[in-house]
C-alpha cells in the first residue's frame, strides 16, 4: 500500500503590477497533478508583511490571489497543496511548502522620505494630501505622488501639486470616481541630483479620512417652559444625513458649558426661565454606519439668543 504524496505548487511568485501595494500572488499546479484528476486539489496560502506577528491564511482552488500590502516593508508568503480526505482514503495529504518573498529595493536613507504625510477627504468630495520634505534634503529635491485604486487601469501621477519654495509639498486630487470603500494606494517618491530619495507608501480608504463641512442654519425653538430645542441642517454636499454624528457645545449665561454627541439634527436642552443668554455651536463627523473613522469638521458659526423671551419667537441665523 503505497503512501500518497503530492507535490507543492510550482513557480510560486509575488507579482507587482505597479499598483503601489496591491500585489498578485500566483503559482502553477504541482507536477503529476493528473494522478488526482477526479479530485479537486486545493491550495493553502499564507502571507504577511515581514515583521507582522500573524499570517493571513487563504484556502483556494484558484492559481492566484490578490491583496494589498505595505511596500515600505518586505512581504513573505508560502503555499502548499492540499489533497482532501476524499481523494486519499481517509486523511488529508499536504505537500511541502513552497516559499517566496518580495520587496522593493530601497533607495536612499529613511530620513529622505517625506515626513508627516496627511491626507483629508474634504466633505467626501475633494482629496488633499500634504507632506513635509525629508530631513536634510536639499532644495533641488522634488517629490512626486502616484496613486491607484481598483477601477483605474494604472497608477496615476498627481497633476495639481501644492508647492512651497519650488518644492512639491502636497497634491490636490481630481474627482475620484467610485473610489470609496476600497483601498486607496499612494506612493510618494523623489528625485535629487545629490542623493537618492527613499519612497514612501500609504494605504487608506477614503471614507475613513472624511472631514465634513460644519452644519448650517442653527436655530432655537422653545418647546416648553423648561425645554429649548436646538436644530441645525446637514452640511451641503454629497454626505447623506444618516452618515453624520454631531458634537454640540452649549454655553448658558457664560458659565455652564454643556457638550453632547448626538446622531440627529436636533438636541433638546433643559433650561430655567432665568436663562438670559444661550449660545451653541455644532460640528459634524462621519459616523460608524458609514466609515470606520473620520475627522471632525470645523465648528459651525456660533448661534446665540440674548435677553429676550425664547417663547416669543424662533431665532434663525
Amino acid at each position: 500500500d503505497t503512501e500518497i504524496k503530492v507535490n507543492p505548487p510550482q513557480d510560486f511568485e509575488i507579482v507587482d503590477p505597479g499598483y503601489l501595494g496591491y500585489l498578485y500572488l500566483q503559482w502553477q499546479p504541482p507536477l503529476s497533478l493528473d494522478h488526482f484528476k477526479e479530485c479537486t486539489v486545493e491550495y493553502e496560502l499564507k502571507y504577511r508583511n515581514i515583521g507582522s506577528e500573524t499570517w493571513k491564511t487563504i484556502i483556494t482552488k484558484n492559481l492566484h490571489y490578490k491583496d494589498g500590502f505595505d511596500l515600505n516593508k518586505g512581504i513573505e508568503a508560502k503555499i502548499h497543496t492540499l489533497l482532501p480526505w476524499q481523494c486519499t482514503n481517509g486523511s488529508e495529504v499536504q505537500s511541502s511548502w513552497a516559499e517566496t518573498t518580495y520587496w522593493i529595493s530601497p533607495q536612499g536613507i529613511p530620513e529622505t522620505k517625506v515626513q508627516d504625510m496627511d491626507c483629508v477627504y474634504y466633505n467626501w468630495q475633494y482629496l488633499l494630501c500634504s507632506w513635509k520634505p525629508g530631513i536634510g534634503v536639499l532644495l533641488d529635491t522634488n517629490y512626486n505622488l502616484f496613486y491607484w485604486y481598483e477601477g483605474l487601469d494604472h497608477a496615476l501621477q498627481c497633476v495639481d501639486y501644492i508647492k512651497a519654495d519650488g518644492q512639491n509639498i502636497g497634491c490636490r486630487f481630481p474627482y475620484l470616481e467610485a473610489s470609496d470603500y476600497k483601498d486607496f494606494y499612494i506612493c510618494v517618491n523623489g528625485s535629487s541630483e545629490n542623493k537618492p530619495i527613499r519612497s514612501s507608501y500609504f494605504t487608506f480608504q477614503l471614507q475613513n479620512i472624511v472631514k465634513p463641512l460644519p452644519p448650517v442654519y442653527l436655530t432655537f425653538t422653545r418647546e416648553s417652559s423648561c425645554e429649548i430645542k436646538l436644530k441645525w441642517s446637514i452640511p451641503l454636499g454629497p454626505i447623506p444625513a444618516r452618515c453624520f454624528d454631531y458634537e454640540i457645545e452649549i454655553r448658558e449665561d457664560d458659565t455652564t458649558l454643556v457638550t453632547a454627541t448626538v446622531e440627529n439634527e436636533t438636541y433638546t436642552l433643559k433650561t430655567t426661565n432665568e436663562t438670559r443668554q444661550l449660545c451653541f455651536v455644532v460640528r459634524s463627523k462621519v459616523n460608524i454606519y458609514c466609515s470606520d473613522d473620520g475627522i471632525w469638521s470645523e465648528w459651525s458659526d456660533k448661534q446665540c439668543w440674548e435677553g429676550e423671551d425664547l417663547s416669543k419667537k424662533t431665532l434663525l441665523r
Partner: antibody
Framework: QVQLVQSGAEVVKPGASVKLSCKAS????????MSWVRQAPGQGLEWVAT????????YYPESVKGRFTITRDNSTSTLYMEMRSLRSDDTAVYYC???????????WGQGTLVTVSS | DIVMTQSPLSLPVTLGQPASISCKAS??????VAWYQQRPGQSPRALIY???YRYSGVPDRFSGSGSGTDFTLKISRVEAEDVGVFYC?????????FGQGTKLEIK
Amino acid sequence: QVQLVQSGAEVVKPGASVKLSCKASGFTFSSYGMSWVRQAPGQGLEWVATISGGGSYTYYPESVKGRFTITRDNSTSTLYMEMRSLRSDDTAVYYCARRDLRSAMDYWGQGTLVTVSS
Amino acid sequence: DIVMTQSPLSLPVTLGQPASISCKASQNVDINVAWYQQRPGQSPRALIYSASYRYSGVPDRFSGSGSGTDFTLKISRVEAEDVGVFYCQQYNAYPLTFGQGTKLEIK
C-alpha cells in the same frame, strides 16, 4: 483565440547579439509561463529557456546559460529573448511557446529563423 | 539531464493502419510527458499532456499511455494529415528535454 506572433528573421555575425520578440494575445499573459524552443536546420527540438508568469523564475539549459536571457513585459503581453555571443551552432528556427498549467507547451508561435554566419 | 529516446526514428505506415511510437526516459519522470506533432514546414502542435490526456481539438485516434520511464503514442488509423515528425518531451525536471523525433510517412 490564443495567438503568438514572433518577430522577423535575423542574420547576424558570430559574436553579435540579437533580441527576439513574441507578442501574445487571446489569453491572460501574466498567468502563464512562456518558453523558447529552437530547431537547427534538419534537426529536432531543443528547449532554450522558460520564464514564469510574473517573471520571477527563469530556467535555461547549460548550453545557453549566461549568453541568452529570457524576459517578458506583461503590460504589453510580449516575450523576449536576448541572445549574446552568438555562434554558428545557434543558427536555428526559434519558437516561442506558452507553457500550459501542466508545464507542457500547448501553443506555439510561427518561428523566427536566426542565421549566425560570417 | 534526462535523456528521452524514441523508437523507431522512421515509421512508414499504410493509410488507415495503426501506428505506435515508443519513448523511453533515462530516469523516472512519473507522468510528466507531452507529445507533439510537427507537420512539414509548420510549427509543432501539442497533442498529449500528462502522458495520456489529449488537448482539446486533437482527434481521438491519438492516444498516449505510460508512466515512469516507458511511454507510447498510438494512432489508431493513420490519415494523410498525420504525416510529419512526432516528439516526446519530459517536463518532470529542468532542463526540459525532447526525444530525437519519429518521422511518420505514408507507405
